[in-house]
């Protein structure tokens, strides 16, 4: 139950991608507007996204802080223009979201190949090493400080002129493959965390083939 | 409970050719890489091939390239090895396992296909 | 192609003894190395992964070791339940490949 006219928000969502996370929900508001709070399992409340008309607030912030904490957030729902009313229990009108642990769960972006290079019969495949939001001594992240060596990179690969894949693994930002001299091969990449039960896999990275801008050849 | 059950295995004449089927129960193919493993009689392990079922990359060993192709349907939650122009050397037991990009976690229990006139 | 080389292909030993099984890649593999058990008539089982970690569930007596192209698998002390066949499997670049298989055979 709450004040006349004000609906409690639903379908609390984290949407997360390289620890950039927001918070959506529903519904739209008529009437009405919002505030969200977000805290660790043992923390204090802390308040964003005061009063809004938006369903979404951005809460990267907050859980940039400590990627391995779990954090639980709740939307607080208020009549438009009379923030202070209250729901007959006398408490704001509000709805928890699920719990949200960035580390486990924050989605893998789709990553990109950065160059690669031939030297005889092997290529040297970089991976851009993406910068994140989380920071540590003042300095921002990349993907690999964060996740280490529970982050792979799986490595397809294929003769430009033949459709049979194969494929490699790193822990690296960076793959070691043996080619045919004379041939062209194209690329592409996607990261994986093998110890996660769920968003394992990113998508694909875009493809990369030799004899375009990204690579270099030495005899 | 994670499960992996094979089926289609069976008795085939040279040159013929047979689907096997992988079913998978307790999560979801997408979110893992499929392999197909063999074992001939009394033979070690052989490393057929893999599927991503989310975006359906296949890697095979050149071996079979040309003759066995593995695909999914992630609706039904299964992986499939499609086997032509069988020979008596395919005559194995083929194993199906889910692959957490570090290890082979999760094995079916195996189908046997026999190849013979 | 990488090889995986396995040895030794059987051995014979009694309940409690230290039992110890390598496999040496062809070339450099980094840690993409894991250990399964097979007993007759089963499937494959996972036991040692990914620079030595083992499966929850798998007893602390198998543990492995190895990195690059030379890789062990250890039984601290045998149980009755261990006879078997163990093989190694490269899983860092296709074809993956397995060891020949070890059989540990009861003494």
């Known amino acids: 139950s709450g004040t006349t006219n004000t609906v409690a928000a639903y379908n609390l969502t984290w949407k997360s991608t390289n620890f950039k996370t927001i918070l959506e929900w529903e519904p739209k508001p008529v009437n009405q507007v919002y505030t969200v709070q977000i805290s660790t399992k043992s923390g204090d409340w802390k308040s964003k996204c005061f009063y809004t008309t938006d369903t979404e607030c951005d809460l990267t912030d907050e859980i940039v802080k400590d990627v391995k904490q779990t954090y639980l957030a709740r939307v607080f729902s208020y009549p438009a223009g009379n923030v202070e009313s209250t729901g007959s229990a006398g408490e704001p009108l509000y709805e928890n979201s699920p719990e949200f642990t960035p580390y486990l769960e924050t989605n893998l972006g789709q990553p990109t190949i950065q160059s690669f290079e031939q030297v005889g019969t092997k290529v040297n495949v970089t991976v851009e090493d993406e910068r994140t939001l989380v920071r540590r001594n003042n300095t921002f992240l990349s993907l690999r400080d964060v996740f280490g060596k529970d982050l792979i990179y799986t490595l397809y690969y294929w003769k430009s002129s033949s459709s049979g894949k194969k494929t490699a693994k790193t822990n690296t930002n960076e793959f070691l493959i043996d080619v045919d001299k004379g041939e062209n091969y194209c690329f592409s990449v996607q990261a994986v965390i093998p110890s996660r039960t769920v968003n394992r896999k990113s998508t694909d990275s875009p493809v990369e083939c030799m004899g375009q801008e990204k690579g270099e050849f030495r005899e | 409970e994670v499960q992996l059950v094979e089926s289609g295995g069976g008795l085939v004449q040279p040159g013929g050719s047979l689907r096997l089927s992988c079913a998978a129960s307790?999560?979801?193919?997408?979110?893992?890489?499929m392999h197909w493993v063999r074992q001939a009689p009394g033979k070690g392990l052989e490393w057929v091939g893999w599927?991503?079922?989310?975006?359906?990359?296949?890697i095979y060993d050149p071996k079979f390239q040309d003759r066995f192709t593995i695909s999914a349907d992630t609706s039904k939650n299964t992986a499939y090895l499609q086997m032509n122009s069988l020979r008596a050397e395919d005559t194995a037991v083929y194993y199906c396992?889910?692959?957490?990009?570090?290890?082979?976690?999760?094995w079916g229990q195996g189908t046997l296909v026999t190849v013979s006139s | 192609d990488i090889q995986m080389t396995q040895s030794p292909s059987s051995l014979s030993a009694s309940v409690g003894d230290r039992v110890t099984i390598t496999c040496k890649a062809s070339?450099?593999?980094?840690?993409?190395l894991s250990w399964y058990q097979q007993k007759p008539g089963k499937a494959p089982k996972l036991l040692i992964y990914?620079?030595?970690s083992g499966k929850r569930g798998v007893p602390s007596r198998f543990s492995g070791s190895g990195s690059g192209t030379d890789f062990t698998l250890t039984i601290s002390s045998l149980q009755p339940e261990d006879f078997a066949t163990y093989y190694c499997?490269?899983?860092?670049?296709?074809?993956?490949?397995f060891g020949q298989g070890t059989k540990v055979e009861i003494k």
């Open positions: 990914y620079e030595g």
């Open positions: 599927i991503d079922p989310e975006n359906g990359n296949t």
């Open positions: 070339r450099d593999i980094k840690s993409y």
């Open positions: 499997l490269q899983h860092g670049e296709s074809p993956f490949t």
């Open positions: 396992a889910r692959d957490t990009a570090a290890y082979f976690d999760y």
């Open positions: 307790g999560f979801n193919i997408k979110d893992y890489y």
